[in-house]
């Protein structure tokens, strides 16, 4: 029985060459959470973070992505290009699995404000 | 293809310590985590722990704490079990085990070294 | 940790026999359970994943099932290169365990 609730920053929007903090909340479950998975639009791994054994940042992505604050992520020196999808998976004992997901719109203007809200999807 | 081969057998007094290498070809060696799971003769098989070769991170079974050390050199894609106060009932076949899948890590091994017998008597 | 009992410990069975070994684990797993085969002198192969997914290149008279505590491995028809000892092991959360063998003999 899966009782818990993923909470996400939901629709956050940054501005070109800045960073963004990707964060997700697993919420009303005592299940244990035995990793995380950062998945990008195409779904191609960004990083995990094991409960056992920490982070793991894919080669492709050691630039530019930051473990954290806690079990989020950070994106830095943001492209255009990094605009999309971007889905958190908990793995979790006994539950199984909870999915959230995160749209980032990567703004050209310098005017661009960082908004991020946490929204239950 | 994938390969993991590790050293060559051990004869080792109790109260020595071992250390088994495991070296890893075929595949992108900081990408899989790796186990490490003995048999003693005519038994069945136990881990004994696990060891992240990008960030150097472990996980040891309890009945290991503190006698075992995993450790790697990612310039030769090797990993290193160290068992520490040798015992009789040390006496076993260690093999490494490469990880199935980061994205579910921790879980299973695909591919097994050749295993490396280590023989504990006085 | 999560105990897994394997049975039988041993089974006597001729060629072309169907032969089912079962396994439980002392609490529940999903479909989290792995199977492996080991031959004398041999380091252990990955048979089945995800309790019946079949790793690449394992014949199809070796299926897998069961969730949550109980799950079976069968071999529908057993061949000359089956004789050897099945493993099942918990793959759902470190440390990892494995049940204590199932020994397949010739009759």
């Known amino acids: 029985m899966m009782t818990g609730t993923i909470e996400t920053t939901g629709n956050i929007s940054a501005k070109k060459g800045g960073s963004v903090i990707l964060q997700c909340h697993l919420s009303s479950t005592m299940a244990q959470v035995t990793q995380v998975n950062w998945e990008q639009h195409d779904h191609s791994l960004l990083a995990i973070r094991n409960a056992e054994l920490g982070w793991h940042i894919y080669p492709a992505f050691k630039d530019r992505v930051a473990p954290g604050p806690g079990l989020g992520l950070t994106l830095q020196s943001l492209t255009m290009n990094d605009t999309g999808e971007y889905f958190c998976t908990y793995h979790t004992y006994p539950d199984g699995t909870y999915r959230g997901r995160i749209f980032l719109e990567v703004l050209e203007s310098s005017v661009a404000e960082h908004s991020a809200r946490f929204q239950i999807p | 293809q994938v390969q993991l081969v590790q050293s060559g057998a051990e004869v080792k007094k109790p109260g020595a310590s071992v250390k088994v290498s495991c070296k890893a070809s075929?595949?992108?060696?900081?990408?899989?985590?790796m186990h490490w799971v003995r048999q003693a003769p005519g038994q069945g098989l136990e881990w004994m722990g696990i060891?992240?070769?990008?960030?150097?991170?472990?996980k040891y079974a309890q009945k290991f704490q503190g006698r075992v050390t995993m450790t790697r050199d990612t310039s030769t894609s090797t990993v290193y079990m160290e068992l520490s106060s040798l015992r009789s009932e040390d006496t076993a076949v260690y093999y490494c085990?490469?990880?199935?899948?980061?994205?579910?890590?921790?879980?299973?091994?695909?591919?097994w070294g050749q295993g490396t017998l280590v023989t504990v008597s006085s | 940790d999560i105990q897994m009992t394997q049975s039988p410990s041993s089974v006597s069975a001729s060629v072309g026999d169907r032969v089912t070994i079962t396994c439980r684990a002392s609490?529940?797993?999903?479909?989290?359970l792995a199977w492996y085969q080991q031959k004398p002198g041999k380091a252990p192969k990955l048979l089945i994943s995800?309790?019946?997914s079949l790793q690449s290149g394992v014949p199809s008279r070796f299926s897998g099932s069961g969730s949550g505590t109980d799950f079976t491995l069968t071999i529908s028809s057993l061949q000359p290169e089956d004789f050897a000892t099945y493993y099942c092991?918990?793959?759902?959360?470190?440390?990892?365990?494995f049940g204590g063998g199932t020994k397949v003999e010739i009759k």
């Open positions: 075929g595949y992108t060696f900081t990408e899989y985590y």
């Open positions: 092991q918990q793959a759902v959360i470190l440390p990892i365990t």
């Open positions: 609490q529940g797993i999903s479909s989290w």
């Open positions: 995800a309790a019946s």
């Open positions: 085990a490469r990880d199935h899948d980061i994205r579910l890590a921790g879980r299973l091994a695909d591919y």
């Open positions: 060891i992240s070769p990008s960030a150097g991170s472990t």
